[in-house]
Amino acid sequence: CPGACVCYNEPKVTTSCPQQGLQAVPVGIPAASQRIFLHGNRISHVPAASFRACRNLTILWLHSNVLARIDAAAFTGLALLEQLDLSDNAQLRSVDPATFHGLGRLHTLHLDRCGLQELGPGLFRGLAALQYLYLQDNALQALPDDTFRDLGNLTHLFLHGNRISSVPERAFRGLHSLDRLLLHQNRVAHVHPHAFRDLGRLMTLYLFANNLSALPTEALAPLRALQYLRLNDNPWVCDCRARPLWAWLQKFRGSSSEVPCSLPQRLAGRDLKRLAANDLQGCAVATGPYHPIWTGRATDEEPLGLPKCCQPDAADKASVLEPGRPASAGNALKGRVPPGDSPPGNGSGPRHINDSPFGTLPGSAEPPLTAVRPEGSEPPGFPTSGPRRRPGCSRKNRTRSHCRLGQAGSGGGGTGDSEGS
């Protein structure tokens, strides 16, 4: 057993070396090890075949180190590995696409708070058993096509707290078992109409705290199992182009957040769901050089990116403007309230179990600009729309073991409390 470690055989053969100031993966780890705990050290590099001798390894925790490099063959030979925790290694920044190849039994992979800027092609290839993938609180800007294609058993995908600006058509291809997709606190301004085509089992979709001004209902159509949807804290434009979303929300039988309007000015702060159909008239247009709010691409039907309902016809040249108002949106779409500028809001009156599950607090938190938050820190500012009644999966036996966020051997993503007790 390596000097800084404790090794024991019952109930599983374990090599445990947490928080020992180790600067490298120790030599002499017993080959029979089923669990290796190396978290909280100063390890900066995982060389090729570091654990090759450990053929029975099922759990490997390397979280909270200072990993800057993981050799592509670092985990070679670990065919039985089920849990791999690499989180809280902010200097990592990139992972060789071959790193996880051969980990056919892996069901939980933590890559949260690793400073990742991109997901290389084929990074998750062959991980057919993967159920939980933690990618939150990184610096990801894009979701390349088919990144998750092989993850047919993935149930939880955590992508919140990144810098993702759009959800392309093939981003989530192959995720037929996905139950929870968390995309909140990003910079998403555009969702492709077919982005969620394979997500027929999705129950929870979080898109709050993004940059969405519109959302094609075609994107929501495949989500037959959807029960929990959060869309708050986005710059929604509640004019004629919001009618399809408004109609979809009226029919939606699950729980959904408020969808507060940013434009037009007369509807600012109002919840789209509570508007009447005839409130959604005309088109709100930003001032200055013509810059349509609509995020779709220009087509024959939508010249300059304007949807059909916003195109002026010969009979009514003013129909592109909000009725009775100048073509000015003020600064409604420019800047979000900086974190902490608004005090946390409170509901009023006693709370009951059957209260509406979502409420909107004033202010709005900018998606994190830093790649990671240190362990133990709160997110920037207050959460902008915290549901009191947060969605959960239906379960009768009240256990975390089959449906909790972050189950199946994972520690879940996110941070600890920073407040003292």
Epitope: Q136, F158, G392, R395, S401, L405, E419
Partner: antibody
């Protein structure tokens, strides 16, 4: 900095009820899961109940079912624990505690990260 | 309910020693375990959650590991202020249950 400030010590007669308050400062109560834990003199910690953010409901330990009621008032950011039909064995320090996990930050861990200082309830005839 | 069993129930060690406290769950709780420290007359203080995550502000001499049914809290280089009672708690399901506690005394 977030704090949980509990109401003061009380002495109660057997059969009576007691209502302990837990005022949250520095964070909106609507964002939190508050749990209640008690500790009899010289004994260990005993979970009584709290808000389960996954199943969207308040849950109670079976031992206290029917005797304890947990409520919140978001207008004052105060959580309450009421225990009825008091008996001498209910003499204990009662703590409120904030669960670490809250979904908006992407934190899925469950553990009691912040505790109130405790409220001593003495049940004596 | 899940039973949590700590051992030893009390331990006495000297400053600078390494102390290990173990906690066993009556069924698999994955890594859903927290450790608390409580000093006389004070509220408990969270040390570790999710079996191995160190709570903010907790000294690095505290570490946790384990998964499934067996877990350990290790205190390296024991300090006088570590004299306290330590509790484990499973956070895998309801009802939340605590171990009976381990009293750590500094010789």
């Amino acid at each position: 900095q977030m704090q949980l400030v509990q109401s003061g010590a009380e002495v109660k007669k057997p059969g009576a009820s007691v209502k302990v308050s837990c005022k949250v400062s520095g964070y909106p109560l609507s964002e939190l899961s508050i749990h209640w834990v008690r500790q009899a003199p010289g004994k260990g910690l005993e979970w009584m109940g709290g808000f389960d953010s996954e199943d969207d409901e308040t849950v109670y330990a079976q031992k206290f079912q029917g005797r304890v009621t947990l409520t919140d008032d978001t207008s004052t950011d105060t959580a309450y624990m009421e225990l009825s039909s008091l008996r001498s064995e209910d003499t204990a320090v009662y703590y409120c505690a904030r669960d670490l996990g809250y979904l908006t930050s992407g934190n899925y861990y469950d553990a009691f990260g912040i505790w109130g200082r405790g409220t001593m309830i003495t049940v004596s005839s | 309910d899940i039973q949590m069993t700590q051992s030893p129930s009390s331990v006495s060690a000297s400053v600078g020693d390494r102390v290990t406290i173990t906690c066993r769950a009556s069924q698999d709780i994955n890594r859903w375990l927290a450790w608390y420290q409580q000093k006389p007359g004070k509220a408990p203080k969270l040390l570790i959650y999710a079996a191995s995550r160190l709570q903010s502000g907790v000294p690095l001499r505290f570490s946790g590991s384990g998964s499934g049914t067996d877990f350990t809290l290790t205190i390296n280089s024991l300090q006088p202020e570590d004299s306290a009672t330590y509790y484990c708690q499973q956070t895998n399901n309801f009802p939340r249950t605590f171990g009976q506690g381990t009293r750590l005394e500094i010789k």
